[in-house]
Amino acid sequence: PGPPAGSPRVSSDPRADLDSAVLLTRSLLADTRQLAAQMRDKFPADGDHSLDSLPTLAMSAGTLGSLQLPGVLTRLRVDLMSYLRHVQWLRRAGGPSLKTLEPELGALQARLERLLRRLQLLMSRLALPQAAPDQPVIPLGPPASAWGSIRAAHAILGGLHLTLDWAVRGLLLLKTRL
């Protein structure tokens, strides 16, 4: 007989689960890339933009070789939860200038939520702890101006793009080691 109803299915193939997470991450990377390009077309960015409330980049050139699956999944999930919060905030407080991108931001949020669910499932199947963010959640106030919300959007999409690119690299490498 199978496991009792309601209990999580133990994966017989962690590689297949990880593969599925990689593909979802790549899909989200494609969406983020496209939306960031749209942002640059509509609201050209003058230089790099940053936002103090965004997670710091998890990677450096030297870290890929020493990655371990629990660390990558935990860090990725925590960072993506932060980005989800920022995308929600952008949709809520972005103002009229970002309203034209509302359908795309909504789709991005939905795919981000889907990836987070997939990561949560993967972590539970691998019996990894569902770590809570180790940093305090910084409340996000309204942008100071219309230009402030545009700069914030550039920063959020740019940071998410780099985070996802790093995640794809890490997950692909880890999959070859499984």
Epitope: D19, L23, L24, R26, S27, L29, A30, R33, L57, M59, S60, A61, G62, T63, L64, L162, D165, W166, V168, R169, L172, L173, K175, T176
Partner: antibody, heavy 119, light 111 residues
Framework: EVQLVQSGAEVKKPGASVKISCKAS????????MDWVKQAPGQRLEWIGD????????IYNQKFTGRATLTVDKSASTAYMELSSLRSEDTAVYYC????????????WGQGTTVTVSS | DIVLTQSPASLALSPGERATLSCRAS??????????IHWYQQKPGQAPRLLIY???NLESGVPARFSGSGSGTDFTLTISSLEEEDFATYYC?????????FGQGTKLEIK
């Protein structure tokens, strides 16, 4: 015009190293990754690796891990591939190509650098 | 690694004829709404040139006589009416997984 311009042909002895450069122009260098592809005479194209110019963090084809090293100089919009412990089978044309990990195809290619390994 | 097998290895046709080139993958390269197969053209002494990405999307600047189709493991590049400049070698590439790999190529020659 979007362009990738590679360094010139190289002739090396077995056991030596070679470092090829790839200078990007006509686009924002950090908006795309840089991939490297080998084409040996009579062989199929072979992907070597990929690097993100913003963060470094290259990934490699396992076949080239340990011998290929990918680096970038963001300020010069230039990517580099170094191949060490050269052997005769490394005689090939090496291409840099613009890519990204979401869909991972190569839409702009350098003109190629011929590397000949001969004693 | 995923192995891509192209057929035929070579094909001799006349200008104006239709060319059909095949690429078969050793496992499915279609998933999450994408088919991760791309097609390139290469002429002697030149770098490859992207023609089709994600199985059926025509790259900017590529003539409309080129088209791509297929899903799963079987893919096709079609040139509806051959022009002189189309005689070259064609490669498929997958990007479903690490490492991306290429087919061995199909050489299209003038009859």
């Amino acid at each position: 015009e979007v362009q990738l311009v590679q360094s010139g042909a190289e002739v090396k002895k077995p056991g030596a190293s070679v470092k090829i450069s790839c200078k990007a122009s006509g686009y924002t260098f950090t908006d795309y990754n840089m991939d490297w592809v080998k084409q040996a005479p009579g062989q199929r194209l072979e992907w070597i690796g990929d690097i993100n110019p913003t963060i470094g963090a290259p990934i490699y084809n396992q076949k080239f891990t340990g011998r290929a090293t990918l680096t970038v100089d963001k300020s010069a919009s230039t990517a580099y591939m170094e191949l060490s412990s050269l052997r005769s089978e490394d005689t090939a044309v090496y291409y840099c190509a613009r890519g990204e990990l979401a869909h991972w195809y190569f839409d702009v290619w350098g003109q190629g650098t011929t590397v000949t390994v001969s004693s | 690694d995923i192995v891509l097998t192209q057929s035929p290895a070579s094909l001799a046709l006349s200008p104006g004829e239709r060319a059909t080139l095949s690429c078969r993958a050793s496992k499915s390269v279609s998933t999450e709404g994408y088919s991760y197969i791309h097609w390139y053209q290469q002429k002697p002494g030149q770098a490859p040139r992207l023609l089709i990405y994600l199985a059926s999307n025509l790259e900017s600047g590529v003539p409309a006589r080129f088209s791509g189709s297929g899903s799963g493991t079987d893919f096709t590049l079609t040139i509806s009416s051959l022009e002189e400049e189309d005689f070259a070698t064609y490669y498929c590439q997958h990007s479903r997984d690490l490492p991306p790999t290429f087919g061995q190529g199909t050489k299209l020659e003038i009859k």
